[in-house]
């Protein structure tokens, strides 16, 4: 059976394609696909920030090659940023660490 | 209940701390901690590459700030690279796509 971390990586990949496969380039997320992915798969991250300008800003920030779409590499950078935010929260609670050094 | 992608991000964070918390700086992976993480959590990625030279090379590649340890950001870059490799494999099998465009 796959280990949790291997499963996590598989989820990252399959979630991307679940939405990138809906319209246009099937290996990229356009704005509406990104919006749907965020709303359905990352509701905790999104919170109440569902206004159009917020989505446009996020899309722009992720779209490093400026093609109006988010490719898998750009998506990975995004997930890494969220993971780093989660990690900062995690590191702020040392009692939650699995073991002290 | 957390969505699969949110769970995946949580696993990324908790797996890092499960090993970084063993010795030295509790927010970084030293070489032995990295080796243990890879062996136990990413056996499919590692395969048979368990020789010392391979580990040294991988450690060197991940350690972008050259402090002989892998911090959370460097670990995220590493996981993104693995995810991108998985994605290339995934994209190579169009019949596995959730939907054609």
């Amino acid at each position: 059976m796959a280990c949790p971390l291997e499963k996590a990586l598989d989820v990252m990949v399959s979630t991307f394609h679940k939405y990138s496969g809906k319209e246009g380039d099937k290996f990229k997320l356009n704005k509406s696909e990104l919006k749907e992915l965020l709303t359905r798969e990352l509701p905790s991250f999104l919170g109440k920030r569902t206004d159009e300008a917020a989505f446009q800003k996020l899309m722009s920030n992720l779209d490093s090659n400026r093609d109006n779409e988010v490719d898998f590499q750009e998506y990975c950078v995004f997930l890494s940023c969220i993971a780093m935010m989660c990690n900062e929260f995690f590191e702020g609670f040392p009692d939650k660490q699995p073991r002290k050094k | 209940m957390a969505c699969p992608l949110e769970k995946a991000l949580d696993v990324m964070v908790s797996t890092f701390h499960k090993y970084s918390g063993k010795e030295g700086d509790k927010f970084k992976l030293n070489k032995s901690e990295l080796k243990e993480l890879l062996t136990r959590e990413l056996p499919s990625f590692l395969g048979k590459r368990t020789d010392e030279a391979a580990f040294q090379k991988l450690m060197s590649n991940l350690d972008s700030n050259r402090d002989n340890e892998v911090d959370f950001q460097e670990y995220c870059v590493f996981l993104s690279c693995i995810a991108m490799m998985c994605n290339e494999f995934f994209e190579g099998f169009p019949d596995k796509q959730p939907r054609k465009k």
């Epitope: 246009g24 704005k31 446009q56 800003k57 899309m59 722009s60 920030n61 490093s64 090659n65 400026r66 093609d67 109006n68 | -």
Partner: antibody, heavy 120, light 107 residues
Framework: QVQLQESGPGLVKPSQTLSLTCTVS?????????WNWIRQFPGKGLEWIGH???????NYNPSLKNRLSMSRDTSKNQFSLKLSSVTAADTAVYYC?????????????WGQGTLVTVSS | DIQMTQSPSSLSASVGDRVTITCRAS??????LNWYQQKPGKAPKLLLY???RLHSGVPSRFSGSGSGTDYTLTISSLQPEDFATYYC?????????FGGGTKVEIK
């Protein structure tokens, strides 16, 4: 109201490096925008040079890439352009612009432009 | 690079006329087409983005349409302040490229 102001020498000798700075005022020099350089040749044609944006991400026009360098100083609300080994063909009005985050990333604010002449 | 071709390169019109300028891209730019107006000695100003969306403060007599490779800028009733040069620009991919411009002159 966002304002952009280009500054730098108006005359550059051939083979030297053209250096320009753009100062942004009226809006914080935020990560939400990309900051561009565009030039307009005497014949009125417009050419995109490059931009700098989120996380310091930089994209250059491939036709100029090997001569081009862009940077930014967020503490001064400035970004700059260096174009090396200039020739008379680089004579143009140079504009700095802000690229909006809306669909198609239009250039919504422009500096007034600065004429750079390459001549000995 | 995506080539942008504008036509006509210049036109003469009178106040009140309906004016149409076309822009053709060398490949599909998926509606990521922006239009600018430039007056002599001034910087270009954004008019429309994403084919048909009016930039803030731009009069409603300006409109845009098109898809794929072919796009149009229309001025429904030309005003004295509209005599200028108009440029299209694709925002689909890098490097960004512009059309050669259309100069609208007084007849």
């Amino acid at each position: 109201q966002v304002q952009l102001q280009e500054s730098g020498p108006g005359l550059v000798k051939p083979s030297q490096t053209l250096s320009l700075t753009c100062t942004v005022s009226g809006d914080s020099f935020t990560n939400d925008y990309y900051w561009n350089w565009i030039r307009q040749f005497p014949g009125k044609g417009l050419e995109w040079i490059g931009h700098i944006g989120y996380g310091g991400n930089i994209n250059y026009n491939p036709s100029l890439k090997n001569r081009l360098s862009m940077s930014r100083d967020t503490s001064k609300n400035q970004f700059s352009l260096k174009l090396s080994s200039v020739t008379a063909a680089d004579t143009a009005v140079y504009y700095c612009t802000r690229e909006s985050f809306y669909d198609g990333y239009p250039f919504d604010y422009w500096g007034q432009g600065t004429l750079v002449t390459v001549s000995s | 690079d995506i080539q942008m071709t504008q036509s006509p390169s210049s036109l003469s019109a009178s106040v009140g006329d309906r004016v149409t300028i076309t822009c053709r891209a060398s490949q599909d730019i998926r509606n990521y087409l922006n239009w600018y107006q430039q007056k002599p000695g001034k910087a270009p100003k954004l008019l429309l983005y994403y084919t048909s969306r009016l930039h803030s403060g731009v009069p409603s007599r300006f409109s845009g349409s098109g898809s794929g490779t072919d796009y149009t800028l229309t001025i429904s009733s030309l005003q004295p302040e509209d005599f200028a040069t108009y440029y299209c620009q694709q925002g689909n991919s890098l490097p960004r490229t512009f059309g050669g411009g259309t100069k609208v002159e007084i007849k």
